[in-house]
Interface confidence: low
């Protein structure tokens, strides 16, 4: 059962796993949610009746029954983890805590103009978990305007104390605001020989990389595969760090794989969601339950629905035994990973999908697309919406993309002459315009947010957000697309598609069926040569064939240029402008979304 509200002056008795320090009960709830075993917590707020050494303690708790006895205690705030909830969860915490000093290892001290600058510095420093900033009013003259960057083993403070005229806060890496590079490569036959901060068991290097990504201290990893010569180290995932933030030594070793934490691009890749099945593999751990199941998929469902289950092993039924049902072993461990991994016993293992909601919805795999052909099929581009205007008569105006459950990203130029959001309707999950009838459900638009530097499409800043009046329930036919990571600026996308209901030639009409075209990206230098009368800025991205023939056109405006990278679709561009349509040596020009990620997050995450 999902319980989101906090219980004031209430303490849960027993069930303690560990104690951490957090600046608020709200953040304690987030820490509990991300902890592999925590189901409940008790936080102690500052209070004259409470011993100051216990202020800001966050006690993480577990219980077989998923609840614990409640005791009245002033200044105690208790609650449940969000593991039991189905809604999207984020570790992003933008709050600034006034007059609180969050203790940790102070590894960097520098002058900063503001707390915001200090937070940005922390966000862009590979080691930084949180910071404390001494304001202009701080009593000690030599410490004023000093920004202290801090880290700890757990990613949370080792203590929190009251201190006048300082402010503290957390790194915004988990808000997708870091400019740190995102190195997605996994290096085969490589061992990184730096200090290990932890080790876990993992079935493959990808799971190892994901574990590294959400481990607070891990910057890179080495994984020993099941063919590794030393038996005791097979399937071992070593989580590593170094002072420089990069591996100091790389050793060539067969059957080992190494890679980097994907912390700075974690909002656009699955980090918690290990959805694969591992055949002829047994995961060992503490047994939670043994139940009969028809298949390994059914076993995974059972694990996902059992809140304490972290991973499972399914042993298929022996012929004609138990109505064809096999045994499903639901398991858990202290760190969420198997305590040992065995091969050759015939089991099929995997992980709970409960944690998938901690990843961005946009990373979910969608149905395979049909290659070739220009008409799309239902569910092929589930983020694509059709934006209609109802004035003077109802018609398709522009495309757009779902980027959040209340947000559509589109082009600013679509709203030329649009006086009010009241005349707009957003239809999602649509393949054919003819599906839209008077009674077709739509999303009303609460607000149009146009970039304040927008003047005209060709000058750039052709980007706008629509805040919807109601939230989108994600389904197979309507779900978000990932924004590109700022750390992915140098990625070369090779699988890019433009979609829309726009014209198929310069003089045409809106198409009934959603059209798609695979289009190669063009360098900005090349694009600039084709548009000498314009300034092609780094905030634009171009795509098109030299010989023309495939392009966006009138009515596609605002729609996505979607590129697939590492199995995840990213919204690389917004259809903006171009000379004519599909003309020879005239690429389409798109708003370069990666350059606006800060703007998008600022607008969509505004309180």
């Amino acid at each position: 059962e999902c319980v989101t509200q906090l219980l004031k002056d209430t303490c849960f008795e027993g069930g303690d796993i560990t104690t951490v320090f957090t600046p608020s009960a709200k953040y304690c709830q987030v820490v509990c949610t991300y902890h592999p075993r925590c189901l409940l917590f008790t936080f102690t707020a500052e209070s004259p009746s409470e011993d100051p050494t216990r202020w800001f303690t966050c006690v993480l708790k577990d219980s077989v029954t998923e609840t614990l006895p409640r005791v009245n205690r002033t200044a105690a705030i208790s609650g449940y983890s969000f593991k039991q909830c189905s809604h999207q969860i984020s570790a992003c915490n933008k709050d600034i805590y006034v007059d609180l000093d969050m203790k940790g290892i102070n590894y960097n001290s520098s002058v900063a103009k503001s707390a915001q600058e200090c937070q940005e510095r922390c966000t862009d420093d590979v080691h930084c978990h949180f910071f404390t900033y001494a304001t202009r009013q701080f009593p000690s003259l030599e410490h004023r305007n000093i920004c202290l960057l801090k880290h700890t083993q757990t990613g949370t403070p080792t203590r929190i104390t009251k201190l006048d005229k300082v402010v503290s806060g957390f790194s915004l890496k988990s808000c997708a605001l870091s400019n740190l590079a995102c190195i997605r490569d996994i290096f085969p036959n490589t061992v990184f020989a730096d200090s290990n901060i932890d080790s876990v068991m993992a079935p493959d290097a990808f799971v190892c990389g994901r574990i590294c990504t959400h481990h607070p201290g891990c910057l890179f990893f080495t994984f020993f595969s099941q063919e590794w010569p030393k038996e005791s180290q097979r399937n071992l995932c070593l989580l590593k760090t170094s002072e420089s933030g990069l591996p100091s030594t790389r050793i060539k070793k067969s059957k080992a794989l190494s890679g980097f934490s994907l912390q700075s691009c974690r909002h656009s890749i699955p980090v918690f969601c290990h959805s694969s099945f591992y055949h002829d593999t047994d995961f060992l751990g503490e047994e939670l339950d043994i139940v009969a199941a028809k298949s390994h998929e059914a076993c995974q469902k059972l694990c996902t629905n059992a809140v304490r289950c972290q991973f499972f092993t399914y042993t298929p039924a022996q012929a004609s035994c138990n109505e064809g049902k096999g045994k499903c072993y639901l398991k858990l461990s202290s760190n969420g990973s198997p305590t040992k991994i065995l091969h050759g016993r015939g089991g099929i293992s995997g992980y709970t999908l409960r944690l998938c909601k901690m990843d961005n919805e946009c990373t979910t795999k969608i149905k395979p697309r049909i290659v070739g052909g220009t008409a799309s099929v239902r569910g092929e581009w589930p983020w694509q919406v059709t934006l209609h205007t109802t004035s003077p008569t109802q018609r398709h105006l522009c495309g757009g993309s779902i980027i959040g459950n209340q947000w559509i990203l589109t082009a600013a130029h679509c709203f030329y002459g649009v006086e009010s959001p009241k005349i707009l309707r957003v239809y999602s999950g649509i393949l054919n315009q003819s599906e839209i009838k008077e009674d077709t459900s739509f999303f009303g638009v609460q607000e149009i947010i146009i970039h304040d530097q927008y003047k005209m499409a060709e000058s750039g800043y052709d980007i706008a957000l629509l805040k919807l009046e109601t939230t989108v329930n994600y389904t197979d036919s309507q779900r978000p697309i990932c924004l590109p990571s700022k750390g992915d600026r140098n990625v070369i996308y090779t699988d890019c598609w433009v979609t829309g209901w726009g014209y198929r030639k310069l003089r045409d009409k809106i198409q009934n069926t959603l059209q798609k075209a695979k289009i190669p990206l063009v360098t900005n230098e090349e694009c600039q040569k084709r548009y000498r009368g314009h300034k092609i800025t780094h905030k634009m991205i171009c795509a098109g064939y030299r010989e023309g023939g495939k392009d966006a056109c009138k009515g596609d405006s605002g729609g996505p240029l979607s590129c697939k990278h590492n199995e995840v679709w990213h919204l690389v561009g917004i259809t903006s402008w171009g000379e004519g349509c599909a003309q020879r040596e005239r690429p389409g020009v798109y708003t370069n979304v990666v350059e606006y990620v800060d703007w998008i997050l600022e607008k969509t995450q505004a309180v």
Epitope: A411, H413, C414, Y416, M456, A457, E458, D462, G502, K505, L506, R507, D508, R530, Y531, R532, G533, H534, A552, C553, K554, G555, D556, S557, G558, T575, S576, W577, G578, E579, G580, C581, Q583, E585
Partner: antibody
Framework: EVQLVESGGGLVQPGRSLKLSCVAS????????MTWIRQAPGKGLEWVAS????????YYPDSVKGRFTISRDNAKSTLYLHMNSLRSEDTATYYC????????????????????WGQGASVTVSS | DVRMTQSPASLSASLGETVNIECLAS??????LAWYQQKPGKSPQLLIY???SLQNGVPSRFSGSGSGTQYSLKISTLQSEDVATYFC?????????FGGGTKLEIN
């Protein structure tokens, strides 16, 4: 105010050459395709040549292809028409014109339509 | 190239009347049609493009219609300053072609 001013017209013998110039003002010259259109005395309009905004491509009807060359100097906001091997049927008023485009995103559309005309330069080819 | 046939070649009408000029294309030009007005001794001026879109500054008594291969220009409430020759032009590709013109006079 958009202005297109032609010069260089006159009387020329068949087989000889002539160069027309057109100075543009009042608009961003390098955003527009430019076109020469001619009109024989008492007759209709005939398209002669077009050039893209950056000068990268040029287009001609069969009647003048290989004899006429359109060019532009964006730095000087000037359009040119070099006419070689002139014939009597080339006698006409030659108009320097600007092609229209709509500029609003993918409503930014190039039309092969003229929305501004010069006053015309008279060319007479006669012996 | 697309051939454009304009009719009538000339016409005479009274002030305040409505007149129609027709233009026939030799193939479908997808509404890629413009109308120009050329007053005596002057350069032509764009009236209409996209078959029915009025160019900025052009009086609303001028209107265009049609699709496929058949198009027309309508001038309602004829005024003395409308005395001119009217040309249609197709632009379904850059090889634009014009109609022969229609000379409009006042009775």
């Amino acid at each position: 105010e958009v202005q297109l001013v032609e010069s260089g017209g006159g009387l020329v013998q068949p087989g000889r050459s002539l160069k027309l110039s057109c100075v543009a003002s009042g608009f961003t010259f390098n955003n527009h395709w430019m076109t020469w259109i001619r009109q024989a005395p008492g007759k209709g309009l005939e398209w002669v040549a077009s050039i893209t905004d950056n000068g990268g491509s040029t287009y001609y009807p069969d009647s003048v292809k290989g004899r006429f060359t359109i060019s532009r100097d964006n730095a000087k906001s000037t359009l040119y028409l070099h006419m070689n091997s002139l014939r009597s049927e080339d006698t006409a008023t030659y108009y320097c014109t600007r092609d229209r485009y709509d500029s609003d995103g993918y409503y930014y559309v190039r039309y092969y339509v003229v929305d501004a005309w010069g006053q015309g330069a008279s060319v007479t080819v006669s012996s | 190239d697309v051939r454009m046939t304009q009719s009538p070649a000339s016409l005479s009408a009274s002030l305040g009347e409505t007149v129609n000029i027709e233009c026939l294309a030799s193939e479908d030009i997808y509404s890629d049609l413009a109308w120009y007005q050329q007053k005596p001794g002057k350069s032509p001026q764009l009236l209409i493009y996209n078959a029915n879109s009025l160019q900025n500054g052009v009086p609303s008594r001028f209107s265009g219609s049609g699709s496929g291969t058949q198009y027309s220009l309508k001038i309602s409430t004829l005024q003395s300053e409308d005395v001119a020759t009217y040309f249609c032009q197709q632009y379904s590709n850059y090889r634009r072609t014009f109609g022969g013109g229609t000379k409009l006079e006042i009775n």
